[in-house]
Amino acid sequence: LRLLDHRALVCSQPGLNCTVKNSTCLDDSWIHPRNLTPSSPKDLQIQLHFAHTQQGDLFPVAHIEWTLQTDASILYLEGAELSVLQLNTNERLCVRFEFLSKLRHHHRRWRFTFSHFVVDPDQEYEVTVHHLPKPIPDGDPNHQSKNFLVPDCEHARMKVTTPCMSSGSLWDPNITVETLEAHQLRVSFTLWNESTHYQILLTSFPHMENHSCFEHMHHIPAPRPEEFHQRSNVTLTLRNLKGCCRHQVQIQPFFSSCLNDCLRHSATVSCPEMPDTPEPIPDYMPLW
């Protein structure tokens, strides 16, 4: 988790002098509770936005927006703590809005935004806005949270972001898998415009089960420049196991930008359709 590097972070707006500060996620009001505390944020909204760094890279960011309730507690509102927790790693990053002037009621509802938390594709985050000072131990909570799921690199808008492109999102291998005679599969896919090797991972399963009955790995050497964007055809030999008929073919590239952590593409071949009617049993059994 990190903040987007561009521009000084600003939270001031007409009628309010405000500064954005790094935060330890442990506001002083936890340790030294105050008697009077503000009410919670209203209408917390989170959207996925995209922002360029000074270097021109494009990153997905969480755009966080909320409003204040129209009650007298804004007189005691000293700021806000914005917290983003990445759920699969428990990593947390916080910033603090510090109000340098007192808020006054005005004709429009107070609204705040922040769009500088960089988020990763296919990750889930808990986004929390805490008004400051935080409440006394038994006080009503004055925060709002939402669990926000970022689309993965298959998403059209995510595909062109720097983290997705670095993991090979622009490569579309257009995999085709064909079952041949004599227990073989022909796998065909389009090579990318980089001289890097690929790996085909074959996993076979019984018709209705999810534990594998056959696994095979096939290495494809790095193509020459004249082979870029051409189709690569590979024939894989299957194990002659009755019922081991559902095949998942996964292609793993090793692009220089993502090495062994590139996006993989896969295709599945289903088991052949079983005939609806059973084979007829003959009326008589030959004796020889």
Epitope: L48, N147, F148, E154
Partner: nanobody, 126 residues
Amino acid sequence: EVQLVESGGGLVQPGGSLRLSCAASGFTFDDYAMHWVRRVPGKGLEWVSGISWNGGSLDYADSVKARFIISRDNAKDSLYLQMNSLRAEDTALYYCVKEEGLGFCRGGSCSTFDFWGQGTLVTVSS
């Protein structure tokens, strides 16, 4: 022009099933999370279920969990709600709604719903 057109509502007995459909047009359907929201007679709006852009994440209100199934077909720009074990309290006008922003939130929407269908009426009565 964004359009969301619901269908599939009707009168059904308690314990019965219905499948609602929503045909979307006028926007890139597979960019956005979609939701079902219902308006119960004499009450306010209630969020029912949501689905992420690719159908990989689903979420349901507690009142419909294990009875309703949300799904989508991005190739057909369509959203669905399979409603099973229907109860009298499911009687409502059901709306198909589009999330304004990109991303998906559990327990409701991340942002506002910027487009709504006209609704399809579901009546559960014996």
